[in-house]
Interface confidence: medium
């Protein structure tokens, strides 16, 4: 059962598994949600105790029955983990706490103009978990405007105290706001030296990487595969750190793999969710339950629905035995990982999918005007929307992309002559324009936000946001696309598609079925050569075939240039302008979304 409300002046008795310090009950609930075993918590506010050392304590709790006795206690705030809930969970905490000092190791001290600048510094520093900023009013002259970057072993403060004229807050890495490099490569036959901060068992290097990303102190990792010669170290995932933030030495080791935490690109790749099945593999751990089910998928479903289950092993049924039902062993451990991994046992193992909701919805796998394009199938481009105007008559105006449950990203030039958002309708989950009838449900537009530097498409800043009047419920046919991560500046996209209902040739009509075309990206230098009369800026991105034949065209404007990278679709471009349609040596020009990520986040999170 999902319980989101907080219980004031209530203390949950017993079940303690860990105590951390958090600046608020809300943050305590998030910490509990991300802890592998925490189901309930009690937070102690200032008024709950005479002893200031007990203030801001967040006691994480577990219970076999998923509940604990309630005791009245003034100042205590208790609640439940969001693990039991189906909504998306984020570790992102943008709150700034006034007159509080979160304690940790102060490893960097520098002057900053504002708390925001200090928070940005923390977000862009590989080691920083949280910061304290002494304001201009701070009594001690030499400490005014000082920004202290801090870290701890757990990522949470070692204590929190009241301190006048300071503010404190967390790194925004988990909000996808870091400018740190995002290194996605996994390096084969490589071990990184440097100190190990922890080790866990993992079935493959990708699970190891996700665990590293989720661990507050892990910056890079080394994974010893099943083929590793030393048996005791097989499937061992070493979580590592270094002072510089980079591995000091890489050692060639056959059957070892190494890579980096994805903490600075957390929102553009699945991080928490381990969805694969591991055949002929047993995960060892504390047994929670044994249930007879048909197949390993059913076993995973059972684990996902059992709130305390972290991983499972399915023992397939012996032939003609027990109506084809095998044994499903639901398991857990102190850290969420198997205590040992055994191969060659005939079992099929995997993890709960409960943590998938901690990933951005945009990373969920989807079903495996477009000149020279082909028709799409339903659910193929679930972020694509059709934007209609009702004035003077209803018609398709532009494309757009879902980037949040209340936000559509599109092109600014679509709104030439649009006086009011009232005449706009956004249709979501549509494949054929003919599906749109008078009674077809649509989303009204509350606000049109056009980039204030936009003048005309050809001179850039051709980007706009639509805030919807109501929120979108995500389904297989309507879900968001990921924005490119700022750490992805060096990614070379090779699998890019442009989609829309636009013209199939220069003089044509809007298409009924959503069209798609695979189009290669073109370098800006190459693009500039094709458009001598225009300035192709770094805020634009070009795509097209030298010989022409495939391109976006009238009616596709505002729609996405979607590129698949590491199995995740990213909104790389917004269809903006071009010379004709699909002309030889005239690539399409798109708004380079990466360059506007800050603008998008500023507007959508205001």
């Amino acid at each position: 059962e999902c319980v989101t409300r907080l219980f004031k002046d209530i203390h949950f008795e017993g079940g303690d598994i860990a105590t951390v310090f958090t600046p608020s009950a809300k943050h305590c609930q998030v910490v509990c949600t991300h802890h592998p075993r925490c189901l309930l918590f009690t937070f102690t506010g200032e008024s709950a105790s005479e002893d200031p050392t007990q203030w801001f304590t967040c006691v994480l709790k577990d219970s076999v029955t998923e509940t604990l006795p309630r005791v009245n206690r003034t100042g205590a705030i208790s609640g439940y983990s969001f693990k039991q809930c189906s909504h998306q969970i984020s570790a992102c905490n943008k709150d700034i706490y006034v007159d509080l000092n979160m304690k940790g190791i102060n490893y960097n001290s520098s002057l900053a103009e504002s708390a925001q600048e200090c928070q940005e510094r923390c977000t862009d520093d590989v080691h920083c978990h949280f910061f304290t900023y002494a304001t201009r009013q701070f009594p001690s002259l030499e400490h005014r405007n000082i920004c202290l970057l801090k870290h701890t072993q757990t990522g949470t403060p070692t204590g929190i105290m009241k301190l006048d004229k300071v503010v404190t807050g967390f790194s925004l890495k988990s909000c996808a706001l870091s400018n740190l490099a995002c290194i996605r490569d996994v390096f084969p036959n490589t071990a990184f030296a440097d100190s190990n901060i922890d080790s866990v068992m993992a079935p493959d290097a990708f699970v190891c990487r996700r665990i590293c990303t989720h661990h507050p102190g892990c910056l890079f990792f080394t994974f010893f595969s099943q083929e590793w010669p030393k048996e005791s170290q097989r499937n061992l995932c070493l979580l590592k750190t270094s002072e510089s933030g980079l591995p000091s030495t890489r050692i060639k080791k056959s059957k070892a793999l190494s890579g980096f935490s994805l903490q600075s690109c957390r929102h553009s790749i699945p991080v928490f969710c381990h969805s694969s099945f591991y055949h002929d593999t047993d995960f060892l751990g504390e047994e929670l339950d044994i249930v007879a089910v048909k197949g390993h998928e059913a076993c995973q479903k059972l684990c996902t629905n059992a709130v305390r289950c972290q991983f499972f092993t399915y023992a397939p049924a012996q032939a003609s035995c027990n109506e084809g039902k095998g044994k499903c062993y639901l398991k857990l451990s102190s850290n969420g990982s198997p205590t040992k991994i055994l191969r060659g046992t005939g079992g099929i193992s995997g993890y709960t999918l409960r943590l998938c909701k901690m990933d951005n919805e945009c990373t969920t796998k989807i079903k495996p005007r477009i000149v020279g394009g082909t028709a799409s199938v339903r659910g193929e481009w679930p972020w694509q929307v059709t934007l209609h105007t009702t004035s003077p008559t209803q018609r398709h105006l532009c494309g757009g992309s879902i980037i949040g449950n209340q936000w559509i990203l599109t092109a600014a030039h679509c709104f030439y002559g649009v006086e009011s958002p009232k005449i706009l309708r956004v249709y979501i989950g549509i494949l054929n324009q003919s599906e749109i009838k008078e009674d077809t449900s649509f989303f009204g537009v509350q606000e049109i936000i056009i980039h204030d530097q936009y003048k005309m498409a050809e001179s850039g800043y051709d980007i706009a946001l639509l805030k919807l009047e109501t929120t979108v419920n995500y389904t297989d046919s309507q879900r968001p696309i990921c924005l490119p991560s700022k750490g992805d500046r060096n990614v070379i996209y090779t699998d890019c598609w442009v989609t829309g209902w636009g013209y199939r040739k220069l003089r044509d009509k809007i298409q009924n079925t959503l069209q798609k075309a695979k189009i290669p990206l073109v370098t800006n230098d190459e693009c500039q050569k094709r458009y001598r009369g225009h300035k192709i800026t770094h805020k634009m991105i070009c795509a097209g075939y030298r010989e022409g034949g495939k391109d976006a065209c009238k009616g596709d404007s505002g729609g996405p240039l979607s590129c698949k990278h590491n199995e995740v679709w990213h909104l790389v471009g917004i269809t903006s302008w071009g010379e004709g349609c699909a002309q030889r040596e005239r690539p399409g020009v798109y708004t380079n979304v990466l360059e506007y990520v800050d603008w998008i986040l500023e507007k959508t999170q205001a």
């Epitope: 030495t249 060639k252 056959s254 060096n490």
Partner: antibody
Framework: QVQLVESGGGVVQPGRSLRLSCAAS????????MHWVRQTPGKGLEWVAL????????YSGDSVKGRFTISRDNSKSTLYLQMNSLTAEDTAVYYC????????????WGQGTMVTVSS | DIQMTQSPSSLSASVGDRVTITCRAS??????LNWYQQKPGKAPKLLIY???SLQSGVPSRFSGSGSGTDFTLTISSLQPEDFATYYC??????????FGQGTRLEIK
């Protein structure tokens, strides 16, 4: 064909700076790790610095740490070495080299550029 | 750091001779060892990678062997164009990347 061409060498006074460039052609520069290796007159080879294919990681040898900075511009297929606080010990032929194969071996080299540090 | 020691530091041989140059690592480097040839005024050229794999375009008279700490470069029948300086290099633990001090092969 695969080619690396260094430039920017010359005679410089101690304490001054110099920037070497290395222009790559004939291969996809942005896919590969690049290095600088130097050779002092009549002596052996000494590794100077390396940079990952995407510029995300950089390392340098102890003798140049804090003085030399390696960088790259993948859009221009060019590798750079910014050399500051030069001393007579930095006098050498500087080679730009890359690892384009699957093993960590320098399989592509430039012709080298001479740097002389002298007052 | 891993030290690489070559021997001999120089040697004289005649065309047609079989020549062996050795390289020793200060610790085990598995088979992560490369050999280079350098002629005066020229850049080094990769001959052998991963201890025994011949780089494409390199004549088959060059061969490499060894693993762990001891490695050998062999030229089975010396040709006039083979007179040069030869370097070994470890790529096991990097950075730093370390080279041997070189072996100068001269005409007798």
């Amino acid at each position: 064909q695969v080619q690396l061409v260094e430039s920017g060498g010359g005679v410089v006074q101690p304490g001054r700076s110099l920037r070497l460039s290395c222009a790559a052609s004939g291969f996809t520069f942005s896919n590969y790790e690049m290095h600088w290796v130097r050779q002092t007159p009549g002596k052996g080879l000494e590794w100077v610095a390396l940079i990952w294919y995407d510029g995300s990681n950089k390392y340098s040898g102890d003798s140049v740490k804090g003085r030399f900075t390696i960088s790259r511009d993948n859009s221009k297929s060019t590798l750079y070495l910014q050399m500051n606080s030069l001393t007579a010990e930095d006098t050498a032929v500087y080679y730009c080299t890359g690892i384009t194969g699957t093993e960590d071996a320098f399989d592509v080299w430039g012709q080298g550029t001479m740097v002389t540090v002298s007052s | 750091d891993i030290q690489m020691t070559q021997s001999p530091s120089s040697l004289s041989a005649s065309v047609g001779d079989r020549v062996t140059i050795t390289c020793r690592a200060s610790q085990s480097i598995s088979s992560y060892l490369n050999w280079y040839q350098q002629k005066p005024g020229k850049a080094p050229k990769l001959l052998i990678y991963a201890a025994s794999s011949l780089q494409s375009g390199v004549p088959s008279r060059f061969s490499g062997s060894g693993s762990g700490t001891d490695f050998t470069l062999t030229i089975s029948s010396l040709q006039p164009e083979d007179f040069a300086t030869y370097y070994c290099q470890q790529s096991y633990s990097t950075p730093p990347i370390t080279f041997g001090q070189g072996t100068r092969l001269e005409i007798k």
